[in-house]
Amino acid sequence: EVEKTACPSGKKAPEIDESLIFYKKWELEACVDAALLATQMDRVNAIPFTYEQLDVLKHKLDELYPQGYPESVIQHLGYLFLKMSPEDIRKWNVTSLETLKALLEVNKGHEMSPQVATLIDRFVKGRGQLDKDTLDTLTAFYPGYLCSLSPEELSSVPPSSIWAVRPQDLDTCDPRQLDVLYPKARLAFQNMNGSEYFVKIQSFLGGAPTEDLKALSQQNVSMDLATFMKLRTDAVLPLTVAEVQKLLGPHVEGLKAEERHRPVRDWILRQRQDDLDTLGLGLQG
């Protein structure tokens, strides 16, 4: 806490400007009006306030807005956002995507901090669902964002938002998450033709059931081994040798290199040796 002291004569700040960086902490506390600071927050980021001086500015805003900052202030917090605790952020009501973008920009290039996680949580809850524009923004800053959500949270993602998802956004998703996302993707892309559909649905296939894989095998999709290896084991096991051959097309030769790994290993053990021999890969069931 900064002690309350009177502002020295002639040091009262008429505006937020660079001269303030030469103020000691107690002078900032005594000589900068909190309401002035709030209305001129957009200037703070352009001024190289020290780490300690930012503490004082935050303290002034906290006193002015004990119930939480208004969005007009939040949008211009800049680096001061990094001084906020999750408890501070829980008091906020952030509704503008522009505000969210401005704050995520401050944290750009760094891992998702507890502050950012809290901010996103508040924003998404305020919107009621993870709409396409929000998802677009969040995955642009944090490609792994989608996979950080629980299956329950993912259930609030409308199918229309799936169009914003890029393959790399799903890299760290586990099967439980893909189980939720796959039906949404299937719905979102249902009106596309075969080859275009496969390109879009491919990264979601870790959540696909057997019957959908069987259907894909009839469409000459030539699934690569990397995608095949991410399929649910329980969805792959019922596939016949002929179906897998059709599903993989020219990539079927890659099964040999993966024969000791799931789901290939488990699938091989379910097949008749005669059927495996038709592939000519030397796979042993």
Epitope: I21, F22, Y23, K24, K25, W26, A46, P48, F49, T50, Y51, E52, Q53, L54, D55, Y79, L82, V106, K108, G109
Partner: antibody
Framework: DVQLQESGPGLVKPSQSLSLTCSVT?????????WNWIRQFPGNKLEWMGF???????NYNPSLKNRISITRDTSKNQFFLKLNSVTTEDTATYYC?????????????WGQGTLVTVSA | QIVLTQSPAIMSASPGEKVTMTCSAS?????MYWYQQKPGSSPRLLIY???NLASGVPVRFSGSGSGTSYSLTISRMEAEDAATYYC?????????FGGGTKLEIK
């Protein structure tokens, strides 16, 4: 890992200008940090000289304000120190250093330093 | 500007001994930073935000303090700790350094 490397002439004549370059690898000088020059006099006293910020704005130690200029070349990821009208009192080891936080606070990364002697 | 005064200027300690050095500020601060410098090398950050250990710094180093009085402690002196230690503030401009404490091995 962030690395900084100072370079420039080791000997400067009095009244001339001292010019040094800091070459940065492992980070971009536009990436949101403060890029500083610090010097250490022969008696080991350390003095902060100034910085250039990620957005190109500067701040200098008031004791040097009229003599110092810090600039940058973002295409080469380098920043520069120019100190005018040097005297023998400017003989020191000059370091470039990067801030460790999003606001001025501590110096997390330092160059190895370059000794500059001011002598006729 | 804020003046930092370090004491003692020079000290010596035996291996295994506990070492404490202090840094006094002319104005109240929230954070202090500490550096270690060995001959021929640049300063190396040891402690930030008064008590946080910088990456790769042995846990025998610790920092504490508040207001105008701060200290750096080495719980058990080792030969490699022989160096000069500097405190630094950037509460307000310009940032300043202490004059240093030279720590020698007995």
């Amino acid at each position: 890992d962030v690395q900084l490397q100072e370079s420039g002439p080791g000997l400067v004549k009095p009244s001339q200008s001292l010019s040094l370059t800091c070459s940065v690898t492992g980070d971009s000088i536009t990436s949101g940090y403060y890029w500083n020059w610090i010097r250490q006099f022969p008696g080991n006293k350390l003095e902060w000289m100034g910085f250039i910020r990620f957005d190109g704005t500067n701040n200098y130690n008031p004791s040097l304000k009229n003599r110092i200029s810090i600039t940058r070349d973002t295409s080469k990821n380098q920043f520069f120190l120019k100190l005018n009208s040097v005297t023998t009192e400017d003989t020191a080891t000059y370091y470039c250093a990067r801030e460790g936080s999003y606001a001025p606070a501590w110096f997390a990364y330092w160059g190895q330093g370059t000794l500059v002697t001011v002598s006729a | 500007q804020i003046v930092l005064t370090q004491s003692p200027a020079i000290m010596s300690a035996s291996p295994g001994e506990k070492v404490t050095m202090t840094c006094s500020a002319s104005s109240s601060l929230s954070y202090m930073y500490w550096y270690q410098q060995k001959p021929g090398s640049s300063p190396r950050l040891l402690i930030y935000d008064t008590s946080n250990l910088a990456s790769g710094v042995p846990v025998r180093f610790s920092g504490s303090g508040s207001g105008t009085s701060y200290s750096l402690t080495i719980s058990r002196m080792e030969a490699e700790d022989a160096a000069t230690y500097y405190c630094q503030q950037w509460s307000s401009y310009p940032p300043t350094f202490g004059g240093g404490t030279k720590l020698e091995i007995k």
